[in-house]
């Protein structure tokens, strides 16, 4: 398992599949905010969840997301995208049985209720970026990242690696 702080540990056998091991290798409960410190919040509306990007009032409680980490083996000859080796993937769940999904057709990020095993649309390559930020790249669509557009989460195509650090795809994870 990853060394983790105050979160349940997993010590599962890992296998050399695309995502190695069916169970996550660690989990981390964190609040998610943008580079500009706006909070990502989740609201139940008409029996479905909506995702918002908003400024919280002082002392307003932040919503938490459970990040489940998976180890992924990514051989370049299979993927054809010039990316190889080991990488970390995550799924994000703000509430039981609901996970963030990439809707590549609509370029949107949605909350879907589903059972395990989760579909590929629920997995994101986790990028460790500068300024204590992370980015989430769609497993199903390399080069497409979760980003902020018009106070909502959306899928944003990053045209080149030089644009990987544009602020609208940078997020902060915090235990508080």
């Amino acid at each position: 398992a990853f060394g983790i702080s105050g979160v349940q540990k997993y010590t599962r056998a890992l296998h050399d599949s695309s995502i190695t091991g069916i169970s996550p290798i660690t989990e981390y409960l964190a609040s998610l905010s943008t580079y500009n410190d706006q909070s990502i919040t989740f609201a139940l509306e008409d029996e479905s969840y909506e995702i918002y990007v908003e400024d919280l009032k002082k002392d307003e409680k932040k919503d938490k997301v459970l990040l489940s980490y998976y180890e992924s083996q990514h051989p370049s000859n299979e993927s054809g995208d010039g990316v190889d080796g080991k990488m970390l993937m995550v799924t994000l769940s703000p509430t039981k049985d609901f996970w963030l999904h990439a809707n590549n057709k609509e370029h949107s990020v949605e909350l879907h209720k589903c059972e395990k095993p989760l579909p590929d649309q629920a997995f994101f390559v986790l990028h460790n970026m500068h300024s204590n930020c992370v980015s989430f790249e769609c497993k199903t669509d390399p080069g497409v990242f979760i980003g902020v557009k018009d106070n909502h989460l959306a899928l944003i195509k990053v045209d080149s690696s030089e644009n990987l650090c544009t602020e609208n795809i940078l997020f902060k994870l915090s235990e508080t």
Epitope: G3, S5, T26, M87, L88, H127, N128, E162, C165
Partner: antibody, heavy 121, light 111 residues
Amino acid sequence: EVQLVESGGGLVQPGGSLRLSCAASGFTFNKFWMNWVRQAPGKGLEWVAEIRLNAINYVKDYAESVKGRFTISRDNAKNSVYLQMNSLRAEDTAVYYCIRRNYGNWFFEIWGQGTLVTVSS
Amino acid sequence: DIQMTQSPSSLSASVGDRVTITCRASESVDRYGISFMNWFQQKPGKAPKLLIYAASNQGSGVPSRFSGSGSGTDFTLTISSLQPEDFATYYCQHSKEVPYTFGQGTKVEIK
């Protein structure tokens, strides 16, 4: 096959300059952060410099021991990363390794074979 | 800067022995629920090779006898049954933030 090949090492006098090159192959070079690490003869490993991606330019970081003297750069068109070393000192004598971080930038994954730099009069 | 203190600096062991190397960071190397702690193996005249990343995950092609554990500041590399090809120098390293520092190394020699 993923490969990093360093070149440019050699003997140089104190105060002199040297430019190390690292040629990358077998992967999409511009998707990865690159580093240099050195190892003095019979000693341990010391991180030297990193070049990572940024929206406007490249973010570069250096060890205190080389700051102001060494410059890291990259040419994505040539799949290469460089280390320009100026005002060289005897204590810069080491094998210099070029390193690629993993995709997602969590750890040092691929190392080159190294190139020896000797600073001596 | 985060300092890495590795121990022992050297050890003698026999083939089949269980070997444990420890590394202590001067402050936590955890972030995002992950420990930014890595272990490398280096043989004479060769480049270091990644063994373990994120405290406990094996690098590509690393035999299962190598395992890592720990979080926060205290970490361990274990070789469950030492093989002839394992005699080498082992380094811990954190990759949380610059400067990325290494431990001073542990040389594993044949008894």
